[in-house]
């Protein structure tokens, strides 16, 4: 008799999830010599322990604490790049500007990037059929709690000038409901962070508007200023040229506005 299984509204656990996490861990520790001491089997065991046999709507930050401990890593606090709705460009940037870090450049972020996972209460099975959707089912699901936890800790670690890349093509360039808007903004530490500098990335070739004047950017400035952190904003009119100039800053065309 087939066992009844809870049907959730979101996609199920990513295929080959255990193998993917383990393989990513091994790859990361090979690429980053300072992390070569990490025992990837222990990392997987801690990751698994956070959600296996637990109700997927009842996950807490505490569940991920053993994993957090194993993911201990040096991140220069003044080299942090946050992003919202423009992940690919942020990652392309840190691949070139190697001394800056997005969350996904850390071990923990790298392990979980673009993956979905959940378990079932009282069974050791991983649910590959469906997982809770943040809106339709519950917010305390394994994926959402993981990203909320690591995003909060990442923002708490930041200091001096923190950069954030925002998508100028979105109707809400700054979205209060994004992870950046709901978690990271509120966990920057005013005693450590002097300035939040927003980079608004333009989508259209001929778009010469000053998107730093957008109402949602003004809203971000207001939130940040109330937290006693300075705010600055730059338009990145040509993201392709921006990346090219990060690669080759001596190029003569890189002195003009990008």
């Amino acid at each position: 008799v087939p066992r009844w299984r809870q049907q959730w509204s979101g996609p199920g656990t990513t295929k080959r999830f255990p193998e993917t996490v383990l393989a990513r861990c091994v790859k990361y520790t090979e690429i980053h010599p300072e992390m070569r001491h990490v025992d990837c089997q222990s990392v997987w065991d801690a990751f698994k322990g956070a959600f296996i046999s637990k109700h997927p709507c009842n996950i807490t930050e505490e569940d991920y604490q053993p994993l957090m401990k194993l993911g201990t890593q040096t991140v220069p606090c003044n080299k942090i790049l946050l992003w919202s709705r423009i992940k690919d460009l942020a990652h392309q940037f840190t691949q070139v500007q190697r001394d800056m870090f997005t969350l996904e450049d850390t071990l923990l972020g790298y392990l979980a990037d673009d993956l979905t996972w959940c378990g079932e209460f009282n069974t050791s099975k991983i649910n590959y059929q469906s997982c809770p959707d943040w809106r339709k089912d519950c917010s305390n699901n394994p994926v959402s709690v993981f990203w909320k936890t690591v995003s909060r800790r990442f923002a708490e670690a930041a200091c001096d000038v923190v950069h954030v890349m925002l998508n100028g093509s979105r109707s809400k360039i700054f979205d209060k409901n994004s992870t950046f808007g709901s978690v990271e903004v509120h966990n920057l530490q005013p005693e450590k962070v002097q300035t939040l500098e927003a980079w608004v990335i333009h989508g259209g070739r001929e778009d010469s508007r000053d998107l730093c004047q957008d109402p949602t950017i003004k809203e971000l400035e207001s939130i940040i200023s109330k937290r006693n952190i300075q705010f600055s904003c730059k338009n990145i009119y040509r993201p392709d040229k921006f990346l090219q100039c990060v690669k080759n800053p001596e190029d003569s065309s890189c002195t003009s506005e990008i």
Partner: nanobody, 117 residues
């Protein structure tokens, strides 16, 4: 600007004790969780212990549980790590850091603990 200065390290025999101190300045010390992390020769960063801002809550790595005790004196802006029953594998540079991790930045120079007979 957050600044920390670790002290109290040294050479000690296996089974011995040391007390590390960390003097902090540049921020409201009592508002922040504080941690000890360590780096053994040729190894990566390892989290050791964390204490809440008030001092009411502590957490330890399994490898030091029952042997190390983290504490703080908020009136002196100072963090401590009492290390008992020291082992050769505790040999490392010990750093104190603001926050609870897992992401840390070195603020101080650290203090070297060498456990050897």
């Amino acid at each position: 600007e957050v600044q920390v200065l670790e002290s109290g390290g040294g050479l000690v025999q296996p089974g011995g004790s040391l007390r590390l101190s960390c003097a902090a300045s540049g921020f409201t010390f009592s508002s922040y969780a504080m941690s000890w992390v360590r780096q053994a020769p040729g190894k990566g960063l390892e989290w050791v212990s964390t204490i809440s801002g008030s001092g009411g809550s502590t957490d330890y790595a399994d490898s030091v549980k029952g042997r190390f005790t983290i504490s703080r004196d908020n009136s002196k802006n100072t963090l401590y790590l009492q290390m008992n029953s020291l082992r050769a594998e505790d040999t490392a540079v010990y750093y104190c850091a603001d926050g609870r991790g897992p992401f840390f930045d070195y603020r101080g120079q650290g203090t070297l603990v060498t456990v050897s007979s």
